[in-house]
């Protein structure tokens, strides 16, 4: 899986979208999890409604919401009141039994509020960008991460 970078601004909301094949994942609940450490598990943050037919209903866990357009094939996660500690590597998952398929790997970056910037010429607008082409970077971030190996945060 490539990793997609989503950049948001501290104090604001960030919407993360995870497209998927609606037929292939028909009837499956979805989840949003956070990668704990370089080789740690992906810890569940929030999942869609227990009844798949009600997946369109927004479910919250703290400041994170999830909703699933099962016909259009788009899972949407909203991170409200984004803070620096929300930065991290996440996954959108499709659940089947005790297994989880990764729909998308997402790197969330939290930037300082651009309204604080003194030099408007330096402003640039956060959003979504596909992971970079550099094969080494891709490999270093997209390799298989095994559960339970290194607790977060990793030690040197």
């Amino acid at each position: 899986h490539n990793t997609t970078v989503f950049q948001g601004v501290a104090g604001q909301s960030l919407q993360v979208s995870c497209p998927y094949d609606s037929m292939k994942h028909w009837g499956r609940r979805k989840a949003w999890c956070r990668q704990l450490g370089e080789k740690g598990p992906c810890q569940r943050v929030v999942s869609t409604h227990n009844l798949w037919l009600l997946s369109f209903l927004r479910r919250w866990n703290g400041s994170t919401a999830i909703t699933d357009d099962t016909l259009g094939g788009t899972l949407t996660i909203t991170l409200r009141n984004l803070q620096p500690h929300d930065a991290g590597l996440y996954q959108c998952q499709s659940l089947h039994g005790s297994e989880a398929d990764t729909l998308r790997k997402v790197l969330v970056e939290v930037l300082a509020d651009p309204l604080d910037h003194r030099d408007a010429g330096d402003l640039w607008f956060p959003g979504e960008s596909e992971s970079f082409e550099d094969a080494h970077v891709e490999h270093s971030i997209s390799r298989s991460l095994l559960e339970g190996e290194i607790p977060f945060p990793p030690t040197s």
Epitope: E38, Q83, A87, L89, A112, S129
Partner: antibody, heavy 121, light 107 residues
Framework: QVQLVQSGAEVKKPGASVKVSCKAS????????IHWVRQAPGQGLEWMGW????????TSAQKFQGRVTMTRDTSTSSAYMELSRLRSDDTAVYYC??????????????WGQGTLVTVSS | DIQMTQSPSSLSASVGDRVTITCRAS??????LAWYQQKPGKAPKSLIY???SLQSGVPSRFSGSGSGTDFTLTISSLQPEDFATYYC?????????FGQGTKVDIK
């Protein structure tokens, strides 16, 4: 072991720019943010900002907006901090430091040895 | 910006003493607090993250506690190599800010 090695001391004139390098080794460079912190002579620590070596994304403290540019070169596992329009009060030791969190912001764990930048006419 | 206030600014202690340094944030920062040790002419060394978790390789005589606005760094039995300046830092809100430092010297 994880190590950050910085470039040597610099002497600059007011109005000039300085570029400090920070070469990482012993870990996956693109997996951990690099912070820049400075310390004026006899003073405390001041956070300047960070760069995410994976994406190249940066954020800096308002005080340095428009003057600081943070970049990285993944091929050499190096991060760079350039400060422009130098003033005498920019005289300080500049440190790079690795964040402890994997692609996250979790406080720093390893620091470079520091680079003394002296601004004097 | 969040102001981090350390107290005392300096203290004199003897080897074997129990030393406590406090750090107060001007607003709540949960447990997003780190502690650092710095010796003259050297780079800071990370001691504690997440208010109370010890960094790898740091002696167990160092401990941290607190949450919200009030935090404490404790050295249970001061050793000769512990004479240094200690800084707290919050990483809850931009810009990340440090306390002004607490210098621990020999009595």
């Amino acid at each position: 072991q994880v190590q950050l090695v910085q470039s040597g001391a610099e002497v600059k004139k007011p109005g000039a720019s300085v570029k400090v390098s920070c070469k990482a080794s012993g870990y996956t460079f693109t997996g951990y943010y690099i912070h820049w912190v400075r310390q004026a002579p006899g003073q405390g620590l001041e956070w300047m900002g960070w760069i995410n070596p994976y994406s190249g994304g940066t954020t800096s403290a308002q005080k340095f907006q428009g003057r600081v540019t943070m970049t990285r070169d993944t091929s050499t596992s190096s991060a760079y901090m350039e400060l422009s329009r130098l003033r005498s009060d920019d005289t300080a030791v500049y440190y790079c430091a690795r964040d402890a969190g994997y692609l996250a912001l979790y406080g720093t764990d390893v620091w470079g040895q520091g680079t003394l930048v002296t601004v004097s006419s | 910006d969040i102001q981090m206030t350390q107290s005392p600014s300096s203290l004199s202690a003897s080897v074997g003493d129990r030393v406590t340094i406090t750090c107060r944030a001007s607003q709540g920062i949960s447990n997003y607090l780190a502690w650092y040790q710095q010796k003259p002419g050297k780079a800071p060394k990370s001691l504690i993250y997440a208010a109370s978790s010890l960094q790898s390789g740091v002696p167990s005589r160092f401990s941290g506690s607190g949450s919200g606005t009030d935090f404490t760094l404790t050295i249970s039995s001061l050793q000769p190599e512990d004479f240094a300046t200690y800084y707290c830092q919050q990483y809850s809100t931009y810009p990340f800010t440090f306390g002004q430092g607490t210098k621990v010297d020999i009595k």
